[in-house]
Interface confidence: low
């Protein structure tokens, strides 16, 4: 049936709305800075490294490289930094900044991602003395995403960018269920159209099981809201057990009286005020 | 401009002691380990001993192990080397560098200060 | 301790001529962070030395592109091209990967 495609077109208009950030993030308008920050968005599954690379220009001789992450207050809390002379790491070690051989290029990454790293990243360069200078790259935003198990052979895999986001999830669910009224009108006009006298009360039988086993129709029966909660929870969930990485616990800020959502996680490092991290010296005579 | 000025050298008997002092300016001394290098008259570079920035991690070539003592005032931007049980050996030019293991590494070099170890 | 092996020890050029220098290290100067530390140093008499290039490649700020590094694991090479006079010095490599540091005995670089 012709119908069947009737809510993809809707998701696929919806994804392609979902880049909109990207375009701000890319806009031809911004001001040339001499640092990048690459890729300007990027998604990937809980428990997946995500790894963004910072570009200097040309090679300085004294700086210092700072990644931050824009907090829910715009204010820019420091998740670790590289030193001509050391790797500074964070308080939380998942952040990990590493020089590329070219010398210009640094990888910024952070091990085992979390649904609540979501967010928006920049990285800072300070130019030391006798040229003093400070520069900071383009936001780049970073979403990561709720492990799904592997669907069922007969289920059609999610559409990319919708799991774990809420509202990319409501319209998905949405346009399924719109699907399936068109469907149910279809069978309706179609119904109406044949005469039922040759096949009698079976024909609407017949043409409804169909409707429940189909693929398209899949999401509606299975989807358990409670898997949408996520958002809201408190506390990072546990993905499931053949899926979990095995990782260090780390503790997270709850900000009581309000959701927890991705935009708002406090990273231990941004607790830190004033007081630097403690030292760490590069390859050579002390490996980290 | 990154500066690093050694003083300190000087003749001394062997059994002797002497304490180099390296001031640094031009950045952030407290970012940065230090190292002194030394190169014995017309022979190559040795690294002697290092520092972290903290002072908290050192390290010492085997053969002034237990002689030699690196430490650093970070408020004062200076590093020092003690040297004692001086052996005629230890006769050389020693330099002062920054960086201690390091991309950047052996970046900038003081003028160094020459001691002599003689009877 | 890493051995630095460098050739020739002496080497004498003309001006206008290109002249390479051999650095060989008895393990590999990689790093698991993909960067290679080797530098390149000259000193000139009476005078400290000056760094030239690190990791293996990178000029150090006002050294003109006359200097080229290359080079990879063990075996690195250091061309001066267009030699002229100022050129002349002794020239180290050394690696700042393992402990301790080590350099090269020195290339004595003279002008013919």
């Known amino acids: 049936m012709g119908s069947r495609r009737g809510p993809w077109p809707l998701v696929w208009a919806v994804l392609q709305l979902g880049w909109w950030p990207g375009w701000l993030l890319d806009s031809p308008d911004r001001p040339w800075s001499p640092l990048t920050f690459s890729p300007a968005q990027l998604t990937v599954q809980e428990g997946e490294n995500a790894t963004f690379t910072c570009s200097l220009a040309d090679i300085p001789d004294s700086f210092v490289l700072n990644w931050y992450r824009l907090s829910p207050r715009n204010q820019t809390d420091k998740l670790a930094a590289f030193q001509e002379d050391r790797i500074e790491p964070g308080r939380d070690r998942r952040f990990r900044v590493t020089r590329l051989p070219n010398g210009r290029d640094f990888h910024m990454s952070i091990v085992a991602a979390r649904l609540n790293d979501s967010g928006i990243y920049l990285c800072g360069a300070i130019y030391l003395p006798p040229n003093t200078q400070i520069n900071e790259s383009p936001r780049a935003e970073l979403s990561v995403t709720e492990r799904t198990l592997e669907p069922p052979t007969q289920s059609p895999s999610p559409p990319p960018r919708l799991s774990g986001q809420l509202q990319g999830l409501v319209i998905g669910v949405t346009s399924v269920l719109v699907g399936v009224l068109l469907l149910l009108l279809l069978t309706w006009v179609l119904a109406a159209v044949f005469p039922r006298a040759t096949r009698g009360a079976c024909v609407c039988g017949s043409e409804d099981e169909p409707l429940k086993e189909g693929p398209d129709a899949a999401p509606v029966f299975t989807l358990d809201y409670g898997e949408l909660d996520f958002q809201w929870r408190e506390k990072t969930p546990e993905p499931p057990a053949p899926c979990a990485p095995e990782q260090t616990e780390y503790a997270t800020i709850v900000f009581p009286g309000r959701p927890a959502s991705p935009g708002r996680r406090a990273s231990a490092s941004s607790l830190q005020g004033a007081q630097p991290p403690s030292p760490e010296d590069g390859p050579g005579l002390w490996p980290p | 401009e990154v500066q690093l000025v050694e003083s300190g050298g000087d003749l001394v008997k062997p059994a002797g002691s002497l304490r180099l002092s390296c001031l640094a300016s031009g950045f952030t001394f407290s970012s940065y380990s230090m190292s002194w290098v030394r190169q014995a008259p017309e022979k190559g570079l040795h690294l002697v001993a290092g520092i972290n920035s903290d002072g908290d991690r050192t390290y010492y070539k085997d053969a002034v192990k237990g002689r030699f003592t690196i430490s650093r005032d970070n408020a004062k931007s200076i590093v020092y080397l003690q040297m004692n049980s001086l052996r005629v050996e230890d006769t050389a030019m020693y330099y002062c560098?920054?960086?201690?293991?390091?991309?950047?590494?052996?970046?900038?070099w003081g003028q160094g200060t020459l001691v002599t170890v003689s009877s | 301790d890493v051995v630095m092996t460098q050739t020739p020890l002496s080497l004498s050029v003309s001006p206008g001529e290109t002249a390479s220098i051999s650095c060989k290290a008895s393990?590999?100067?990689?790093?698991?962070?993909?960067?290679?530390?080797l530098t390149w140093f000259r000193q000139k008499p009476g005078q400290s030395p000056h760094r030239l290039v690190y990791?293996?490649?990178h000029r150090h700020p006002g050294v003109p592109d006359r200097f080229s590094g290359s080079g990879s694991g063990t075996d690195f090479t250091l061309r001066i091209s267009r030699v002229e006079a100022d050129d002349t010095g002794l020239y180290y490599c050394g690696q700042v990967i393992h402990d301790p540091w080590t350099f090269g005995a020195g290339t004595k670089v003279e002008l013919k």
């Open positions: 990791a293996v490649s």
């Open positions: 560098v920054r960086g201690f293991s390091s991309f950047n590494g052996l970046g900038y």
């Open positions: 393990q590999s100067l990689l790093h698991s962070d993909g960067n290679t530390y």
